[in-house]
Interface confidence: low
């Protein structure tokens, strides 16, 4: 399987909410012995490999933000811990998984990584990640809503607030 990032760049105004999204692609084994561990973390564009460094998002580690389930199943993080930090990660039945960040500040700007680990017979078989950039802007040049740039081409899409939804 692979992880796709529909958007490689998110440009948002301060105070807005944004949902960063990844998508699990390809054949997914739905056997009883297969578990998927999905999570999010911040990183930097390292010299060797993007996403190799795992930094917390708003003080929450990749362990705090993990989703743990089999195959294309819906799940979301423990609400209390994440929501206190204005965060929620979620997953739906179609392989999409996301992290929603509320009330963005300039400090939220940076590189974000989604990580999927396929666990088979409790042995790590496969680990893949996707990367995307978040730019939070302020002042007169800031967009009124989040603008996202697709990974395949650089045509932008304007995302209004009501598009920031959760998967339950």
């Amino acid at each position: 399987f692979k992880v796709a990032t529909p958007y490689s760049l998110y440009v948002c105004p301060e105070g807005q909410n944004v949902t960063l999204t990844c998508r699990l692609l390809g054949p997914v084994d739905k056997g009883h012995d297969v578990t998927f561990y999905k999570t999010w973390y911040r990183s930097s564009r390292g010299e060797v490999q993007t996403c190799s460094e795992r930094r917390p998002i708003r003080n929450l580690t990749f362990q705090d933000l993990h989703l743990h389930h089999g195959g294309h199943q819906a799940a979301n993080t423990s609400h209390d811990l994440a929501q206190r930090h204005g965060l929620e990660s979620a997953s739906d039945h179609h392989g999409n998984f996301s992290i929603t960040m509320r009330n963005l500040t300039l400090l939220d700007s940076g590189l974000y990584c989604c990580l999927v680990v396929e666990i088979r017979h409790h042995h790590s078989e496969h680990r893949v990640h996707g990367a995307m950039e978040l730019q939070v802007q302020t002042g007169k040049d800031a967009p009124s809503n989040c603008v996202v740039y697709p990974s395949s081409s650089q045509e932008s899409e304007n995302i209004t607030a009501h598009h920031h939804h959760h998967h339950h």
């Epitope: 060797v48 490999q49 743990h68 409790h122 042995h123």
Partner: antibody
Amino acid sequence: QVQLVESGGGVVQPGRSLRLSCAASGFTFSHHAMHWVRQAPGKGLEWVAIIWYDGSNDDYADSVKGRFTISRDNSKNTLYLQMNSLRAEDTAVYYCARDSGFYSSYYFDYWGQGTLVTVSS
Amino acid sequence: EIVLTQSPATLSLSPGERATLSCRASQSVSSSYLAWYQQKPGQAPRLLIYDASNRATGIPARFSGSGSGTDFTLTISSLEPEDFATYYCQQYNSYPYTFGQGTKLEIK
């Protein structure tokens, strides 16, 4: 700061049992898989066992399979290793080590100072 | 089981010199799931490098890791007196986790 403190080592006769403990502090214990690694006197490191963050799965080196049992009590922030049918070749310093992930997907980022187990008649 | 072979078994160098330690795997270590640890007598191992090339928190820049597949290298660019110790490589690609037999770095 992260601390792992092993206890329970000592001298034991072949065929007898011993239980090691590892008290963890300075991090969210229930967010990490944990391991036992041993080192015979003057020798290299040997991985012994792994347990997932929630205790739902474990695995063992062939040399201890069926004799050793790893367990954890997340409410007490403690890792255990129950060692039965001990043999002379089990003589070693036993380290508990934290895995950086929930599962055994990652490296050992913190280690305890170890406890010595001597199996001798 | 993946067997890791470290060479040399002992390396004698002087402070300020460059140290190159090798770790060879019996089969490919996918995604470079290889770590390096330092151990001093009477002490627990300490993580130096993970994922073949990433320095762990607090590890000085003189330590670097490289390699992929079956051949990995730990390099210490300029030896400090505190670097003389035994170094182990370890793969976490598949069970059972395995370590190399170690390279002892001693003062010449």
